[in-house]
């Protein structure tokens, strides 16, 4: 996938919705300039493409939703990269511009004559993309043309600012909420000294900023904070790991507001450097419960505690997806490439036959083998349904008593659609209520996951708690098995009786040395010794002074 030719998935309809999915991995550092994307992705890519196609089929066959109106789509590949996504968004815009200048499908030619060439329908809204940094770039473009955008996993706090991102909405909460959840976990286990890592880019930077601000208010110290690009090379990850080890054994917990591939880079570096088990990673929802993050590096990931957006599997999607085959699936232009990549075999005689694989794909292959549904599938589907319900409400108010697209709705006005979308309220795919606040955000509900060794060489994610609108619930016994196993991540131990904390210049408030007060001094506060006044002496617990009882000497008294 280079910049010369970009594949697009089309589905015809009366109204066309655009979508941006990371069908391929982002370009590696050396390929960024030519915008050459990486390998095809299943969960974040192919599954989301198929979710869009199948969800639209379901919507179109639902007589109560947009009756007499067919929804279609145009799906493009963002490659989880801003430059690629912008290039693709410009294609969406170009369709809209051409469409708005034509009359009844007739395009006016330069010489003044008319042509019967029918151009593509305009995109009324866009679903995605997944990454916050990419979503921001795309929004900057879309809002110029009043095209609403509904995201399914872009959680950056910055996107809540409606003065900057007016046409942006999301079916997921802002990262401010998971930053809070992460701080609540750190507080729960009395970890007062932690290292911090984040992925360079909006998601990681704004999330980590919130985590650090909230930590400071709770008396949690950050040993050091580091940032790294998701597609950084091995050397960068090695250097980062060495820096993290310099804070051991005090800062054993590493809070990682990171994209999944950043976490994988860390795990790989842990393997190279022999650091398995030295850290406990506390990961944001970029990691969640993804197997593509931990595969092959489970020993390094063991013990990790992660935040996952609450989103149960969607059964009807699996029923559809697992039956797909390359012989019959022609509407997904990336499917053959994916099939060959997934099974490491060649589809002989197919248009996209890949000769790099020696083995020929046999007909018994099935997607049921090692199937894992995309953890954000529910959100992807809810985003598509949000667009449909927004259009439905708009049709109801603009075309009362009319089934189908009335003249008042043609062409679709992005401002009116946005208004309608913001008022949307429906039951989502998992039975939860989908609604948007004044910032276009959805409420925050998270699951807390723990990556554990379940048996010999068998590892899995276990649900060990939840965080729902400010309330953290954790099954401590499931995480630690015994209280004595709870990892310590503190800079200094509490001082003993009669000692005060001395914080060295330039050190954080969590790091101190303990110094005993002098013989005639008591502990005034945790940082100060005070001398008792003449005639008094420190109490036994060294927290104050008692008057020394006056003893009068008599002639007959023995020497003291």
């Amino acid at each position: 996938q280079s910049s010369e030719r970009r594949v697009v998935a089309h589905m015809p309809g009366d109204i066309i919705i655009g979508a941006l999915f990371s069908v391929h991995h982002q370009p590696t550092v050396d390929k960024v300039h030519e915008r050459k994307c990486g390998a095809v992705r299943e969960q974040y890519g192919i599954q989301r493409v198929e979710a869009m196609l199948h969800t639209l089929e379901r919507i179109n066959s639902d007589p109560t939703l947009l009756p007499n109106i067919t929804l279609g789509c145009e799906i493009r590949d963002s490659c989880w990269h801003s430059a690629v996504a912008l290039e693709q968004s410009i294609e969406f815009i170009r369709d809209s511009l051409i469409s708005s200048e034509e009359e009844e499908g007739l395009v006016r030619c330069v010489d003044g004559s008319s042509s019967s060439f029918r151009s593509k329908k305009p995109i009324v809204g866009v679903i995605g993309p997944g990454s916050s940094s990419v979503a921001i770039q795309v929004q900057n473009l879309l809002q110029l043309f009043n095209i609403p955008q509904i995201a399914y996993s872009a959680t950056s706090m910055d996107l809540s600012d409606k003065t900057l991102f007016k046409y942006f909405m999301r079916v997921v909460p802002s990262d401010a909420q998971q930053a809070r959840a992460m701080v609540d976990i750190v507080k729960r286990y009395n970890w007062t000294y932690v290292s911090a890592v984040h992925t360079e880019g909006n998601y990681g930077e704004s999330g980590m900023e919130a985590f650090k601000d909230m930590s400071a208010k709770e008396g949690i110290c950050i040993a050091h904070s580091y940032k790294i690009y998701s597609n950084a090379g091995e050397q960068s990850f090695d250097k980062l790991l060495k820096k993290l080890t310099s804070h051991l054994p005090k800062a054993r917990v590493v809070a990682c507001f990171c994209e999944g591939m950043t976490v994988r880079g860390l795990l790989m570096a842990m393997r190279r450097l022999g650091l398995a088990g030295e850290f406990l990673l506390l990961g944001s929802d970029g990691w969640a419960d993804r197997y593509d993050v931990t595969d092959g590096y489970q020993r390094e990931a063991v013990g990790g505690i992660t935040i996952k957006l609450q989103s149960p599997d969607v059964k009807w999607f699996d029923d559809y997806y697992l039956k797909l085959r390359p012989e019959t699936n022609h509407r997904n232009p990336w499917f053959q490439e994916f099939w060959q990549h997934r099974f490491q075999c060649r589809l002989e005689g197919f248009p996209q036959e890949n000769s790099k694989y020696n083995k020929t794909c046999n007909s018994s292959l099935t997607l049921k083998t090692h199937h894992v549904q995309d953890s954000k599938m529910g959100f992807v589907i809810n985003a598509i349904y949000s667009m449909a319900y927004g259009l439905h409400n708009m049709q109801m108010s603009l075309c009362p008593g009319y089934a189908g697209l009335c003249d008042a709705m043609k062409p679709i006005d992005g401002r009116k659609l946005l208004e309608s979308l913001m008022k949307t309220n429906f039951t989502g795919v998992s039975g939860d209520t989908i609604l948007f606040d004044e910032n276009g955000d959805s409420p925050g509900r998270y699951e807390i996951m723990n990556f554990k060794e379940m048996g010999k060489d068998y590892f899995d994610y276990i649900n060990v708690g939840s965080w729902d609108n400010g309330e953290l619930k954790m099954d401590d016994d499931e995480v630690w098995s015994k209280k004595s196993n709870i990892i310590r991540s503190v800079c200094s131990e509490p001082c003993e009786k009669g000692q005060i904390k001395v914080i060295r210049k330039g050190e954080v408030s969590c790091c101190w040395t303990c110094t005993p007060c002098k013989e005639n001094e008591y502990v005034f506060d945790e940082y100060t010794c005070k001398a008792c006044q003449l005639g008094s002496w420190p109490t036994d617990d060294l927290t104050g002074c008692d008057l020394i009882p006056v003893q009068y000497l008599r002639w007959g008294d023995p020497e003291p």
Partner: antibody
């Protein structure tokens, strides 16, 4: 400071334990390594024990050596010495809690394996 | 593994001269390299860590440089006391201890 002890003349196959006694710092904060110097050859790493208790060995040393620790000592057990294990054995402290540059070093203890 | 190759095996220079010892890693060690001096009958002494940081109490005549896979120790204004064996060591990975030390360089001061 760091000091090794336990080096002596042993016959091949007789297990031998070398002890490294430390003072002035805590083994819960620093990794400790064992390095040997075979006469006429260079320095070679045997293994390391991290502050956390994790151990790593050179591939040739796996199964032949075992490193363990208490609060003030680090032991190196040579399970079944051979004549090739004749060397001066050094114990050294890592700069950090895991593998790193090592300093200070102990004076070394001589192990001679001979029949 | 991060195999360390040290050159030359031995070098002889007069008092006041300069000696350069090279150390090559089989793959990048991201400047995590240390240099040691060992005199007969003594334990090694740390001179430089992280490729160029001088250990405490070490003379500034010892200078370390390099990055990636290529590293150099330079000893200037040679003194008789500098006669010793010098070793480089990769400080990056504890899971790859084989050949973590270079083969050593014998420095003779004439």
């Amino acid at each position: 400071s760091v000091e090794e002890s336990g080096g002596r003349l042993v016959t091949p196959g007789t297990p031998l334990t070398l002890t490294c006694t430390v003072s002035g710092f805590s083994l819960s904060r620093y990794a400790m390594g064992w390095v040997r110097h075979v006469p006429g050859k260079g320095l070679e790493w045997i293994g390391i024990i991290y502050a956390s208790g994790s151990t790593y060995y050179a591939s040739w040393a796996k199964g032949r050596f075992t490193i363990s620790k208490t609060s003030t000592t680090v032991d190196l057990k040579i399970t079944s010495p051979t004549t090739e294990d004749t060397a001066t054995y050094f114990c050294a402290r890592s700069r950090t809690a895991t593998y790193d540059a090592v300093d200070p070093w102990g004076p070394g203890t001589l192990v001679t394996v001979s029949s | 593994a991060y195999d360390m190759t040290q050159t030359p095996a031995s070098v002889s220079e007069p008092v006041g001269g300069t000696v350069t010892i090279k150390c090559q890693a089989s793959q990048s060690i991201s400047s995590y390299l240390s240099w040691y001096q060992q005199k007969p009958g003594q334990p090694p002494k740390l001179l430089i860590y992280e490729a160029s940081t001088l250990a405490s109490g070490v003379s500034s005549r010892f200078k370390g440089s390099g990055s990636g896979t290529e590293y150099t120790l330079t000893i200037s204004d040679l003194e008789c006391d500098d006669a010793a064996a010098y070793y480089c060591q990769q400080d990056l990975s504890g899971s790859n201890l084989d050949n973590s030390f270079g083969g050593g360089t014998e420095v003779v001061v004439k």
